[in-house]
Interface confidence: low
């Protein structure tokens, strides 16, 4: 009785089980009662990757350089050619039929995973403490500069797109000293005004004098720093910050601190 099903690697034809052709070979003629299945190897640029009864082999895939493709692995009679993309490009789809340029990570984003021939660049937002100020397919987020390690202070905070701006310590100190100076100046002004009022109110118990011209008061003369002998930090002059000279340490001497 003719079979209704055949074993693995066989096929049913004309009520007969014939052997399938092995990978790399195509069917030339079916088996008969007296002859085996006739198969022929695929030609150079063709392949068949399964046990089959195909009468034609499949053409190897062509990796078209015009589409940015190149051969990653040559095809054999049993396998298809595997294409990949040229440097700087990656496959548009899993079948890799054409290539597109790698994506660049915009400022504020860094490269989490560099692109390959088959996968695009993976970007990630720069977390706090990190930044990226370039559009790049290779650069990761970079850490903010540590001002402390350079004996500097943060003058401008960093963002995900910009690094911190460091500056000398003097500026920080000046920000504290200036209000103090202004306070002292205000107090001195008040004292001077009180003194003037008191002098103006004093009774004239002596002989009349010729009328005196009002004395010009130079408030600056009373300010710290205008008197060379007055102890004052060298970074301040008339309560104005002065740039610290390179190589000089901004410390008050023992004598100055007394």
């Amino acid at each position: 009785e003719p079979p209704t099903a055949c074993r693995e690697k066989q096929y049913l034809i004309n009520s007969q089980c014939c052997s399938l052709c092995q990978p790399g070979q195509k069917l030339v003629s079916d088996c008969t009662e007296f002859t085996e299945t006739e198969c022929l190897p695929c030609s150079e640029s063709e392949f068949l990757d399964t046990w089959n009864r195909e009468t034609r082999c499949h053409q190897h895939k062509y990796c078209d350089p015009n589409l940015g493709l190149r051969v990653q692995q040559k095809g054999t009679s049993e396998t298809d050619t595997i294409c990949t993309c040229e440097e700087g490009l990656h496959c548009m789809s899993e079948s890799c039929e054409s290539c597109v340029p790698h994506r660049s990570c915009l400022p504020g984003f860094g490269v989490k995973q560099i692109a390959t021939g088959v996968s695009d660049t993976i970007c990630e937002p720069c977390p706090v403490g990190f930044f990226s100020n370039v559009s790049s397919a290779f650069e990761k987020c970079r850490p903010w500069t540590s001002c402390e390690t350079k004996d500097l202070v943060v003058q401008q905070a960093g963002t995900n797109k910009t690094d911190v701006v460091c500056g000398p310590q003097d500026r920080q100190r000046a920000l504290v000293v200036i209000p103090i100076c202004l306070g002292i100046l205000f107090v001195i002004l008040l004292l001077v005004l009180v003194f003037i009022k008191k002098v103006a109110k004093k009774p004239n118990d002596k002989a009349p004098h010729p009328k005196q011209e009002p004395q010009e008061i130079n408030f600056l003369d009373d300010l710290p720093g205008s008197n060379p002998a007055a102890p004052v930090q060298e970074t301040l002059h008339g309560c104005q910050p002065v740039t610290q000279e390179d190589g000089k340490e901004s410390r008050i001497s023992v004598q100055e601190r007394q």
């Epitope: 062509y62 015009n66 190149r70 051969v71 692995q73 040559k74």
Partner: antibody
Framework: EVQLVESGGGLVQPGGSLRLSCAAS????????MSWVRQAPGKGLEWVSV????????YYADSVKGRFTISRDYSKNTLYLQMNSLRAEDTAVYYC??????????????WGQGTTVTVSS | SYELTQPPSVSVSPGQTASIICSGD??????VCWYQQKPGQSPVVVIY???KRPSGIPERFSGSNSGNTATLTISGTQAMDEADYYC?????????FGGGTKLTVLG
Amino acid sequence: EVQLVESGGGLVQPGGSLRLSCAASGFTFGSYAMSWVRQAPGKGLEWVSVISDSGGRTYYADSVKGRFTISRDYSKNTLYLQMNSLRAEDTAVYYCAKEGGDYYYYGMDVWGQGTTVTVSS
Amino acid sequence: SYELTQPPSVSVSPGQTASIICSGDKLGDKYVCWYQQKPGQSPVVVIYHDNKRPSGIPERFSGSNSGNTATLTISGTQAMDEADYYCQVWDSSTVVFGGGTKLTVLG
């Protein structure tokens, strides 16, 4: 008959420029990639540049990148190589060659007779 | 950059088989072409796609390529086969030639 004829070679001083031409005939010029290959006296073959069939893609050897430019004129069936900032080491016979089909699969199946470029002061 | 290495010279007696080797890293993954260049002439492709012969090239020329080595074989070598032979591949958008092998037919 498929034919490639180069011209434009000659003597040029270092730092100078030259433009080589390659007139193609006997085949559909726009259907094939085209290459320039050079051969210094007594030396082997050195690839210079290739241009795709459509002209959309160009590739260069590192030794000429930024100095040489390959181009093609479909109306004149002509391939060009513009050579700038020439150096003594660019002295060679320059061949133009037709790619035998799809780039690396078929090799360069037709070559011109070559044109000599001499860079010397 | 990719490199192809060839022996500078190979000698063979007429009628014998000449084998010219071209080696390069994972060369078997690439398609190799072979060119013949006789003195004063332009190169001619004798093998493409590893082992295919263009029309007009005698059957005595054959090619193979696997692993790190490609081989051009000339069986029944004739005096007219005396020439320089170059292997060539495409690698990452560039064409790479081997240094060339001078085939000398003795006698």
